[in-house]
Interface confidence: medium
């Protein structure tokens, strides 16, 4: 019987070449985050938030992934291949496993943005 | 040193309600939860749920939520497991079992010597 | 509910020798970090005693000659060289979720 629920920024959308912030929220219990796991949609793990051991950023992603903010993570310099699903899983003591879900879609930059960002008045 | 104090039998009628006890001595009291187990004879332990002793909080077995109520007494230490309706099938010896935290991997690092439940008329 | 399958159900060692109890979990019980899997003995009248916490870590007071392995599904505790009061019932327990759940038990006889 297990209390609480994740909490998620849902469906989200970003451009190419920019960043984004995955962010999971556990609320209405009072277990005890030990440790918050980072997935991508194949399951390869971009990043552990350990409560004694702190952040690990496997290294895949090092470039790429930063930690924070709290609980959450930044995925910068995005590409066409980060579009799909993102996956926090939270261990908590004394619930066991709490997971949310983000959908991640990154968007093509128009001409017309770029062109209009570097237009010469 | 850490105690967990239960009395050795208790004799109850069926259907009449019982409330088992369980007295803690030896360490900080309110910074631990406390389970309880049923094993029956012959038979492995069924977990029937936990309480932390600062905030009453409660994780039930689904199959014991009809049947288990636990509550905590702050003042004396003291934690009960009441039993609705019982019958024979709730004759068992009952224990409860201190759980300690370790980063979320928790285990039960102390016993009491358990409560031999006898249902009968 | 995590399903916990041990095995053998009961077994029969010669005095000095190595007795070995498997645990199984329906899923997995281990993390990066950590593996959420205790082992127990209790004898007749008695409540269970902890032998080994997180897989492999043996509790204060227990005797070196248990030893505990595994991670993931798999997990094996090992007593060796027996002596005669390890005749007992040993069981497996996981912390992972709510609930908690044990295994079925290994009756252990010393010859």
């Known amino acids: 019987m297990m209390t609480g629920t994740i909490e998620t920024t849902g469906n989200i959308s970003a451009k190419k070449g920019g960043s984004v912030i995955l962010q999971c929220h556990l609320s209405s219990t009072m277990a005890q985050v030990t440790q918050v796991n980072w997935e991508q949609h194949d399951h390869s793990l971009l990043a552990i938030r350990n409560a004694e051991l702190g952040w690990h950023i496997y290294p895949a992603f090092k470039d790429r992934v930063a930690p924070g903010p709290g609980l959450g993570l930044t995925l910068q310099s995005l590409t066409m291949n980060d579009t799909g699903e993102y996956f926090c899983t939270y261990h908590t003591y004394p619930d066991g496993t709490y997971r949310g879900r983000i959908f991640l879609e990154v968007l093509e930059s128009s001409v017309a943005e770029h062109s209009a960002r570097f237009q010469i008045p | 040193q850490v105690q967990l104090q239960q009395p050795g039998a208790e004799l109850v009628r069926p259907g009449a309600s019982v409330k088992l006890s369980c007295k803690a001595s030896g360490y900080s009291f309110t910074s631990y939860w406390m389970n309880w187990v049923k094993q029956r004879p012959g038979q492995g332990h069924e977990w029937i749920g936990m309480?932390?002793?600062?905030?009453?909080?409660?994780r039930l077995n689904q199959n014991f939520l009809d049947k288990a109520t636990l509550t905590v007494d702050k003042s004396s230490s003291t934690v009960y497991l009441q039993l609705s309706s019982p019958t024979s099938e709730d004759s068992a010896v009952y224990y409860c079992?201190?759980?300690?935290?370790?980063?979320?991997?928790?285990?039960?690092?102390?016993w009491g010597q358990g409560t031999t439940l006898t249902v009968s008329s | 509910d995590i399903v916990m399958t041990q095995s053998p159900a009961s077994l029969v060692v010669s005095l000095g020798q190595r007795a070995t109890i498997s645990c199984r979990t329906s899923q997995s019980v281990s993390t990066s970090s950590y593996s959420y899997m205790h082992w127990y003995q209790q004898k007749p009248g008695q409540p269970p005693k902890l032998l080994i916490k997180?897989?492999?870590n043996l509790e204060s007071g227990v005797p070196a000659r248990f030893s505990a392995s595994g991670s993931g599904t798999d997990f094996t505790l090992n007593i060796h060289p027996v002596e005669e009061e390890d005749a007992a019932t040993y069981y497996c327990?996981?912390?992972?979720?709510?609930?908690?759940?044990f295994g079925g038990g290994t009756k252990l006889e010393i010859k």
């Open positions: 309480i932390h002793l600062s905030n009453s909080e409660t």
């Open positions: 997180n897989a492999s």
């Open positions: 079992a201190r759980e300690r935290d370790y980063y979320g991997s928790s285990y039960f690092d102390y």
């Open positions: 327990q996981h912390s992972w979720e709510i609930p908690r759940t």
